[in-house]
Interface confidence: low
């Protein structure tokens, strides 16, 4: 995850990243919108591998919790919003079928704008 | 991937998302910064699974290729930048060791700011 601060840059939205285990996650939403259970371990050729994910979300304690940094406030309302992406995970669906499915995880914090209507 | 446009919102940065196969990807960078080969298929209990990834990057054709949307240009220079996250993939390193490693993939397009110095 490239760090803009190192280049004297600021992010429009502050984010935090962490490693999340399947045990912490427990459930997730798959591509069809269904809730699935995320299995804690994945069988591999030499035993089992702990399943975990790198997640990034908006920092609720950050400066940008009220709105995005650097926005032209005369014309725009802004909000930092966590966005999601898909990663493959070993899961069990509601019918207890185990399989590899793409699940949604938090991967970024982006700024969304709505235009201010003339007062 | 929640679509801000549906809620009458605009993104500060325009992005494009696509499914990328390991065959298209060929290589990636792992967490230690080393280049690894991404294997096309993953062995699972009932055969093989094609390895692919959901990637999001800044739209090079979009309005925001010159800078971010909605920024207060009097005080800030801005740039839309593709950010990366880590996902687990079956890979082969330079010593031909096959294993599950976290690799970097493009997951978002965010806006970075640099403050304008007094003219």
């Amino acid at each position: 995850h490239s760090d803009p601060a190192r280049r004297g840059e600021l992010s429009v939205c502050d984010s935090i990243s962490e490693w999340v285990t399947a045990a912490d996650k427990k459930t997730a939403v798959d591509m069809s919108g269904g809730t699935v259970t995320v299995l804690e371990k994945v069988p591999v050729s030499k035993g089992q591998l702990k399943q975990y994910f790198y997640e990034t979300k908006c920092n609720p304690m950050g400066y940008t919790k009220e709105g995005c940094r650097g926005i032209d406030k005369r014309h725009w309302n802004s909000q930092c919003r966590t966005t999601q992406s898909y990663v493959r995970a070993l899961t069990m669906d509601s019918k207890k079928r185990i399989g590899w499915r793409f699940i949604r995880i938090d991967t970024s914090c982006v700024c969304t704008l709505t235009i201010k209507r003339g007062r | 991937h929640s679509d801000p446009a549906r809620r009458g919102e605009l993104s500060v940065c325009d992005s494009i998302s696509e499914w990328v196969t390991a065959a298209d990807k060929k290589t990636a960078v792992d967490m230690s910064g080393g280049t690894v080969t991404v294997l096309e298929k993953v062995p699972v209990s009932k055969g093989q699974l094609k390895q692919y990834f959901y990637e999001t990057k800044c739209n090079p054709m979009g309005y925001t290729k010159e800078g971010c949307r909605g920024i207060d240009k009097r005080h800030w220079n801005s740039q839309c930048r593709t950010t990366q996250s880590y996902v687990r993939a079956l890979t082969m390193d330079s010593k031909k060791r096959i294993g599950w490693r976290f690799i970097r993939i493009d997951t978002s397009c965010v806006c970075t700011l640099t403050i304008k110095r007094g003219r």
Partner: antibody, heavy 121, light 107 residues
Framework: DVQLVESGGGVVRPGESLRLSCAAS????????MSWVRQAPGEGLEWVSG??????????YYADSVKDRFTVSRDNSKNTPYLQIDSLRAEDTAVYYC????????????WGLGTLVTVSS | EIVLTQSPGTLSLSPGERATLNCRAS???????LAWYQQKPGQAPRLLIY???TRAAGIPARFSGSGSGTEFTLTISSLQSEDFAVYYC????????FGGGTKVEIK
């Protein structure tokens, strides 16, 4: 030994509500998913509802026929699953069984003796 | 919804005879996700077979299951007096559903 003992059945009028309980013992209750299956007099078995154990974050699931009126819940501290039935109808008259789901899938390796619910005006 | 049809509705046999119970699914059941239960009057159902052919713990070897796709069979090789009961099949490929049952009665 695994034991499941249902209670809470009885005679009720159409439109009323009822809450069934199932006292579970002999296994680590919180780890297992539980279901409710009913059997109308002289009829076959009908699965109505299930609830995940701790591994599944107590996700609930229902048969389409009862989705709007039945609510399944559980109290892991009391080793008890519950089935709340609202707006009871004559066709809900049945013996209601509490069943322990096998960890492999939604089939049932242990059953209670059932509790009879009779809906009559 | 997967509909299971059991046949025959009633099977009249003598102790020591072989019983063959059938269960047909309205569509193919993946990975043989089918179970069989026994139910005696006034009692709870008891799991006999799961995954179409695997005997549950404590179930005697005279009970066996077979089949795949849409056709499944429960066989009791030599009926004992305690085997006279109603037998249900259940699929768990989709949300669980049960067949209508086959009653095995003494001839």
């Amino acid at each position: 030994d695994v034991q499941l003992v249902e209670s809470g059945g009885g005679v009720v009028r159409p439109g009323e509500s009822l809450r069934l309980s199932c006292a579970a013992s002999g296994f680590t209750f919180s780890m297992y998913d539980m279901s409710w299956v009913r059997q109308a007099p002289g009829e076959g078995l009908e699965w109505v509802s299930g609830i995940r154990g701790s591994a599944g974050d107590a996700v609930t699931y229902y048969a389409d026929s009862v989705k709007d009126r039945f609510t399944v819940s559980r109290d892991n501290s009391k080793n008890t699953p519950y089935l709340q039935i609202d707006s009871l109808r004559a066709e809900d008259t049945a013996v209601y069984y509490c069943a322990k789901e096998n960890n492999r899938s939604i089939f049932f390796d242990y059953w209670g003796l059932g509790t009879l619910v009779t809906v009559s005006s | 919804e997967i509909v299971l049809t059991q046949s025959p509705g009633t099977l009249s046999l003598s102790p020591g005879e072989r019983a063959t119970l059938n269960c047909r699914a309205s569509r193919s059941i993946g990975s043989s996700y089918l179970a069989w239960y026994q139910q005696k009057p006034g009692q709870a159902p008891r799991l006999l077979i799961y995954d179409a052919s695997t005997r549950a713990a404590g179930i005697p070897a005279r009970f066996s299951g077979s089949g795949s796709g849409t056709e499944f069979t429960l066989t009791i090789s030599s009926l004992q007096s305690e085997d006279f009961a109603v037998y249900y099949c259940q699929q768990y490929d989709d949300w669980p559903s049960f067949g209508g049952g086959t009653k095995v009665e003494i001839k």
